[in-house]
Interface confidence: low
């Protein structure tokens, strides 16, 4: 039986050009997670596997960075990054749990944009 | 206007504590993450500790077990409890929102003796 629950980060803003943290957390479960993987509809954004790392997909590796944690970073968002993204929990011995979410990226207004930081 | 402000930096013993905070205003819609992040002199900048809406919290390992970070919704602020600090974590300290748009002008933690 499945008991665990996904907490994300929801429906999220973030204007274009800037950068934006995805996160999910996975509790009430004892389950292993073997691997997570990010999604957007129905392209792999990246994985993290327990045993061997993370791995982004060759077309995002300029855009996206892992972590923190479990999350994903997006970076140089575009309007065309407006969508669902998902973060899919492989476990043992539960199965997967998915997450859902929402980001809208707007055209950017006057705004001050973060510096480069280093996720570890 | 929208404005990050950080306070409650200083300079602290190794072993002692201090508290930062980040008051957010002036954003059209609340963020469901806060964040903070860090830059020591000549380095990167490296995130340190987030937290979601609903409460739940990642750190660095460098800082696990010594940092705690927390929010108050309401008031659009986020804190860091920083214990057992160390000459390492000297830097400047910065929040940041889910969509890491906007930084402020950061706080100042030096940890010596």
């Known amino acids: 039986m499945m008991t665990g629950t996904i907490e994300t980060t929801g429906n999220i803003s973030a204007e274009k050009g800037g950068s934006i943290i995805l996160q999910c957390h996975l509790s009430s479960t004892t389950a292993q997670v073997t691997q997570v993987n990010w999604e957007q509809q129905d392209q792999l954004l990246a994985i993290c596997n327990a045993d061997l790392g993370w791995h982004i997909s060759p077309s995002f590796k300029d855009r996206v960075a892992p972590g923190p944690g479990l999350g994903l970073t997006l970076q140089s968002l575009t309007v065309n990054d407006t969508g669902e993204y998902f973060c899919i929990y492989h476990t043992y011995p539960d199965g997967t749990y998915t997450g859902r979410i929402f980001l809208e990226v707007l055209e950017s207004s006057v705004a001050e944009h973060g510096a480069r930081f280093q996720i570890p | 206007e929208v404005q990050l402000v950080e306070s409650g930096g200083g300079l602290v013993q190794p072993g002692g504590s201090l508290r930062l905070s980040c008051a957010a205003s002036g954003f059209t819609f609340s963020p469901s993450w806060m964040g903070w992040f860090r830059q020591a002199p000549g380095k990167e900048r490296e995130w340190v500790a987030s937290?979601?809406?609903?409460?739940?919290?990642w750190y660095a390992d460098s800082v696990k077990g010594r940092f705690t970070i927390s929010a108050d919704n309401s008031k659009n602020t986020a804190y860091l409890q920083m214990n057992s600090l160390k000459p390492e974590d000297t830097a400047v300290y910065y929040c940041a929102r889910d969509d890491l748009d906007y930084w402020g002008q950061g706080t100042l933690v030096t940890v010596s003796s």
């Open positions: 937290v979601l809406r609903g409460g739940y919290t």
